[in-house]
């Protein structure tokens, strides 16, 4: 495959946020600018937050777990302790008033998570304007399920339990085909949950590929001594492709694909990403080093997130080499085309210019959102910043820029998209959209020239660096 890496150039990263330092989200003026950015408008999105959401944010203590899920159908889910608040963020001519519902989550020994909340829409377009057309399923890490057939009836729900003998913890719940859901365990077991009109929730395990390590049962694998307690496949991300009725899972070592119909699934393939991608990624970052062959052995790669756009599947990977001084994390976007029954050999690796210092593997916490299916703009985000970049597969590219959310008490709680617009949920400011300013899109091949010709004034906070080798990379704050 071809490894295409970007020139190692830096867009302005020195700029600091001017976010309000208040801990409570305020919505004095609709669509006011949230933070300074060179190339992007960062503004509050939609109408003001519902009172219930404002209250939850205000009453939450600093170390309370708050998680958010921004659904493509135009709804947002905020999980705060044992409460789930769901509200409509994209108001249409039909829904003039913001709809907001509060649901009670099932008991759990764990923190609740918005990754375990999924919305299903009865409308074929994959969105809903009324609560009547929205079904909600939630799960706990242990496998307790609660299902509301309609968001209009908060008190009408059914419960179920996915019994895995206590050996599994669950990571993701995804709405898929025909009003059903897939519950994914941290060790990559996938369970299809199909609500029936009787109120019962039918459950079955998704089939695994034949003759694959990822598919063999723990009983068999432990007999062969293949898996020690700590060496399970770790699930990083899942993806539902509504157009192709395909479900993907990304683990520490493979991408698996299932093709779904309303009640059954077929395992299409499992693809060994370590074998297929490691060399491409390593080559894109360290390929110009004279001791490349020696370096290759010590490279660590973690696959963090999986999204898609018109070019195919987009994987966010973090790579580092502990012998590097300074040791930096190189975030890369890998685009691979899915040919239906297998992955294409053509792989594009875009090494982003976001290279924070490596501290520990546990602190590699970046996520990815690719809001617009038809273009190549990608948004990497962590708790304190959003990094706008490109997958590197298109002719045009937006300038890379780090947008910081680090005012006192602020943090990014989650991100998603609504109508192709990237939406960030910040603790201080609520829903925030990031849109490019007029005419900032540039031809990819002109990127180097345009950055090099920009001049930062002596008192400017923005600094532009031009460099050609990995060694000269400027470390950025995480």
């Amino acid at each position: 495959g071809s490894a295409v890496s970007s020139p190692v150039l830096f867009s302005p990263v020195g700029r600091r946020s001017s976010l309000s330092s208040r801990g409570t989200p305020t919505r004095m003026f609709p669509h006011h600018s949230i933070t300074e950015s060179v190339n992007y408008d960062v503004k509050t999105f939609g109408s003001s937050l519902p009172v219930k959401v404002m209250e939850a944010l205000t009453l939450a203590e600093v170390d309370d777990q708050l998680t958010i899920n921004i659904d493509e159908g135009g709804w947002a889910c905020l999980v705060c302790k044992e409460k789930l608040i769901i509200w409509k963020i994209a108001l249409s001519p039909i829904t003039k008033l913001s709809v907001c519902k509060e649901l009670q989550l099932p008991p759990s020994d764990f923190h609740w998570s918005a990754d375990l909340v999924a919305l299903s829409y009865s409308s074929p377009s994959g969105e809903a304007h009324s609560t009547q057309a929205v079904a909600v399923m939630v799960a706990t890490r242990e496998g307790s399920i609660r299902y509301w057939p309609s968001l209009a009836g908060e008190d009408t729900y059914t419960e179920a339990f996915v019994d895995s003998g206590g050996d599994k913890t669950y990571s993701f719940l995804t709405a898929v085909q025909g009003g059903s859901f897939i519950l994914s365990s941290s060790g990559s077991q996938l369970i299809r949950l199909i609500p029936e009109s009787s109120g019962k929730i039918h459950q079955h395990i998704l089939p695994q590929g034949q003759g694959m390590l990822s598919g063999i049962g723990r009983k068999v694998s432990s007999l062969f001594g293949i898996l020690s307690p700590s060496s399970d496949l770790t699930l990083s991300s899942v993806l539902w492709d509504r157009e192709r009725s395909s479900f993907y899972s990304l683990t520490s070592s493979n991408i698996s694909k299932w093709e779904l119909d309303d009640s059954s699934e077929k395992h299409a393939y499992s693809w060994d990403i370590n074998r297929a991608l490691k060399e491409n990624i390593t080559d894109a970052i360290w390929g110009s080093e004279s001791n490349y062959e020696a370096i290759k052995e010590g490279v660590n790669i973690r696959y963090l997130d999986l999204k898609q756009n018109c070019d195919g599947l987009v994987i966010l990977a973090a790579a580092w080499h502990s012998a590097d001084n300074p040791c930096l994390i190189y975030y890369s976007l890998i685009t691979i085309e899915d040919n239906g029954c297998q992955m294409s050999d053509a792989v594009t690796v875009e090494v982003t210019q976001y290279n924070p210092p490596f501290q520990s593997e546990d602190l590699i916490l970046c996520q990815l959102t690719v809001p617009n299916f038809s273009n190549q703009t990608a948004y990497l985000y962590n708790e304190s910043a959003v990094y706008v970049c490109s997958t590197g597969t298109g002719k045009f590219s937006l300038p890379q820029e780090k947008i910081v959310f680090n005012a006192q008490g602020d943090s990014v709680l989650g991100a998603g998209a609504c109508g192709g617009v990237p939406i960030i949920f910040s603790r201080n400011s609520g829903l925030v959209s990031i849109t490019s300013r007029e005419n900032v899109s540039i031809l990819a091949e002109d990127l180097e020239g345009s950055l090099a010709s920009s001049v930062a004034g002596p008192n400017s906070e923005s600094m532009i660096f031009e460099t050609t080798t990995k060694n000269e990379t400027i470390a950025q704050e995480d």
Epitope: D63, Q65, D109, F110, A114, R141, P229, D362, L365, N382
Partner: nanobody
């Protein structure tokens, strides 16, 4: 870096007691769900006891009333008190920490385990 180190295993007569300890570092114990698992060669690993973030405790049916899980957050240590031990309780007892991080993502960390042998 997160580390879990188990201790307290050994050989005990049937009907006897053991107290296992799991010393943790690199995590805030008060924010972690802590599990004790039992691994027997050729068998599926099974959850024995769990202490949740709100100090709840849950147990597998086969140890209820005999085993007690507890935590000392200030010492960063989790304990498993095992009473009325039977030969079938033998195995490798492994400690697991499940920590919720940024965006609600769960990271799981395992110890190496401590061996429990029960003679009849």
């Amino acid at each position: 870096q997160v580390q879990l180190v188990e201790s307290g295993g050994g050989l005990v007569q049937a009907g006897g007691s053991l107290r296992l300890a799991c010393a943790t570092s690199g995590i805030l114990l008060s924010k972690a769900v802590m599990d004790w698992y039992r691994q027997i060669p050729g068998k599926q690993r099974e959850l024995v006891a769990r202490t949740g973030i709100r100090d709840s405790a849950t147990y597998a049916d086969f140890v209820k009333g005999r085993f007690t899980v507890s935590r000392e957050n200030e010492n960063n240590t989790v304990y498993l008190q095992m009473n009325s031990l039977q030969p079938e309780d033998a195995g490798l007892y492994v400690c697991k920490a499940a920590v919720t991080g940024v965006f609600g993502r769960l990271s799981e960390h395992w110890g190496q385990g401590t061996q429990v042998t029960v003679s009849s």
